[in-house]
Interface confidence: low
């Protein structure tokens, strides 16, 4: 997170830290006691699928305070439409091997109903993004969980206000832009997969997933997030289906 | 809200209760009627919570101890009669007034629903947690807010 602040301990209780072979991989969002939402691109280069760990209740990576809960990732489900190395359909659903225990420091973020997300949450201007990613483009990652308030843009406005870059990916209907184009604040590498959380009348909802951008906090560019509302039915159907064998599963979308 | 009290016994009311503090018994002497005394006393001792005219859209206000109740006209609902029940009450307009989820219905008014782990309150729009750790709430902030002293 570039230009953010420390999320006070316990105030981002749905934030997930994903580790592979003990090393920081990505962020994620707890949506109930056994399921985590993250970004598909986080898993492009994974070879040791059995060494994936999700940590809940984490705050400061340099110390263990007893509120952390670690769970093996039993399954990673990615939409069949996602192509590794690209940006569209950048979403993954992770099934934990065992449920986490909900505590003051471990709470799920609400996965909203699609219509509510599209016609109400999408028009809430500011939302929070969080993670332990880089504090500057090409800089060091954070030890404490960072958080940033970002404004959402309509895709048309995002395209009009962004500098044209020759090989820049399209902003599709499965994405949205949020943040600042003045180079001051953005999510960054290492925050990928983490939550874009929107507050409405006293409750927080998952509206986006940290996905991609032209560098981090680059002048003339916004951060791009996976538009979660497009995947609500896909996620719910998967969460209700019986577990399948194998760690990586490509599930048909839509 | 309590204009009728003024015409009851203006002289003694001014003398006993407005120029100086009066007790419930003294007020009872003035009004000679338990119900009217009670109505006067709620407003007199506690301040009239209806004084700020909180009930909107033609709703009438009844003062209570440290609170008030709005009686809404048929086309309105909500604590302050602020929500329209009529054709404007559809989900695309301010989420239909619902705290969480809203469903439109042909021929009848919209209905509000809540996420799992919450249930709908009697006002038909608000949601209350039914589990210890409902999604989307931050326990340490909820507890902090709950322990803050309330303004009078």
């Amino acid at each position: 997170i570039v230009g953010g602040k420390v999320c006070p301990k316990g105030e981002c209780p749905w934030q997930v830290l994903l580790l592979v072979n003990g090393a920081q991989l990505c962020g994620g969002t707890l949506i109930n006691t056994i399921w985590v939402v993250s970004a598909a691109h986080c898993f492009d280069k994974i070879k040791n699928w059995r060494n994936l760990i999700a940590v809940l209740g984490e705050h400061d990576l340099s110390e263990h305070d007893g509120d952390e809960q670690s769970r093996r990732v039993a399954q990673v489900i990615i939409p069949s439409t996602y192509v590794p190395g690209t940006t569209n359909h950048d979403i993954a659903l992770l099934r934990l091997h065992q449920p986490v225990v909900l505590t003051d420091h471990v709470v799920p973020l609400c996965l909203p109903e699609r219509t509510f997300s599209e016609r109400t949450l999408a028009f809430v201007r500011f939302s929070l993004v969080s993670g332990w990613g880089q504090l500057l483009d090409r800089g060091a990652t954070a030890l404490e969980l960072m958080v940033l308030n970002v404004p959402r843009l309509m895709t048309q406005d995002c395209l009009q206000q962004s500098r044209k870059v020759g090989d820049s990916p399209n902003i599709t209907e499965y994405m949205f832009c949020a943040g600042y184009s003045d180079g001051s604040k953005d999510s960054c590498k290492g925050d990928s997969g983490g939550p874009h959380a929107t507050h409405y009348r006293g409750t927080w909802y998952l509206t986006g997933i940290v996905s991609w951008g032209q560098g981090c906090a680059t002048v003339g560019h916004f951060g791009v997030y996976t538009r979660v509302s497009q995947y609500i039915e896909w996620l719910q159907k998967l969460m209700r289906s019986e577990p399948r064998p194998g760690v990586l599963l490509r599930a048909p979308f839509p | 809200a309590n204009a009728f009290l003024e015409e009851l016994r203006p002289g003694s009311l001014e003398r006993e209760c407005k120029e100086e503090q009066c007790s419930f018994e003294e007020a009872r002497e003035i009004f000679k009627d338990a119900e009217r005394t009670k109505l006067f006393w709620i407003s007199y001792s506690d301040g009239d919570q209806c004084a700020s005219s909180p009930c909107q859209n033609g709703g009438s206000c009844k003062d209570q101890l440290q609170s008030y109740i709005c009686f809404c006209l048929p086309a309105f609902e909500g604590r302050n009669c602020e929500t329209h029940k009529d054709d404007q009450l559809i989900c695309v307009n301010e989420n239909g007034g619902c705290e969480q989820y809203c469903s439109d219905h042909t021929g009848t008014k919209r209905s509000c629903r809540c996420h799992e782990g919450y249930s709908l309150l009697a006002d038909g729009v608000s949601c209350t947690p039914t589990v210890e750790y409902p999604c989307g709430k931050i326990p340490i902030l909820e507890k902090r807010n709950a322990s803050k002293p309330q303004g009078r």
Epitope: N32, M239 | E116
Partner: antibody
């Protein structure tokens, strides 16, 4: 094939504690399921008592919460129910059960024990 | 808590006929409703989960529909083994609650 088997005394005296055990076979109790107790008084409907995860987290019916304890013994692949201060109103068939899948708070009970009848009487 | 009201309490039909059982929730529960069948002396058996998804091994004559507060279990053509008590269950909010049941009896 998942199988659940309830065991415990069929007769309990009023004011005593009812204790039942559910032995699970064909499935590791330390997996991701929720393990429930549900009861059915004679000739009446079903009442959910509560459940436990391997992780140890529990959720009880508020109407029984003050009297109920559900615990798990992973080494024996068993989970147990204790219901204190019983009265004749606690006379019922007690079922142990496993949820088919788990999604937030919403799960359907796909596997049931055959039930054990408990009578509360002096 | 969410109260589920099942109707009718008793339904008398003959084999081959169509059975329609109703379950009404005291407040909206989206599609978090499950149906069970129970025969005398047996444990309940899951028929339908999440309003309309048949559980493993359930015959195609059983189907479920509805959303919000009104739900229906339909048995398209009754077989002799279908005569039993049917319960609906709320899976939306704790405590998990069951309806009082509908007894489907032979006419």
């Amino acid at each position: 094939q998942v199988q659940l088997q309830e065991s415990g005394p069929g007769l309990v005296k009023p004011s005593q504690t009812l204790s039942l055990t559910c032995t699970v076979s064909g499935y590791s109790i330390s997996s991701d399921s929720a393990w429930s107790w549900i009861r059915q008084p004679p000739g009446k409907g079903l009442e959910w008592i509560g459940y436990i995860y391997y992780s140890g987290s529990t959720n009880y019916n508020p109407s029984l919460k003050s009297r109920v304890t559900i615990s798990v013994d992973t080494s024996k692949n068993q989970f147990s129910l204790k219901l204190s201060s019983v009265t004749a109103a606690d006379t019922a068939v007690y079922y142990c059960a496993r949820s088919v899948n788990y999604y937030g708070n919403s799960f359907a009970v796909g596997y049931w024990g055959q039930g054990t009848s408990v009578t509360v009487s002096s | 808590e969410i109260v589920l009201t099942q109707s009718p309490a008793t339904l008398s039909l003959s084999p081959g006929e169509r059975a329609t059982l109703s379950c009404r929730a005291s407040q909206g529960i989206s599609d978090y409703l499950h149906w069970y069948q129970q025969k005398p002396g047996q444990a309940p058996r899951l028929l339908i989960k999440y309003t309309s998804q048949p559980a493993t091994g359930i015959p195609a004559r059983f189907s479920g529909s509805g959303s919000g507060t009104d739900f229906t279990l339909t048995i398209s053509s009754l077989e002799p083994e279908d005569f039993a008590v049917y319960y609906c269950q709320n899976g939306h909010s704790f405590p998990l609650t069951f309806g009082a049941g509908t007894k489907l009896e032979l006419k």
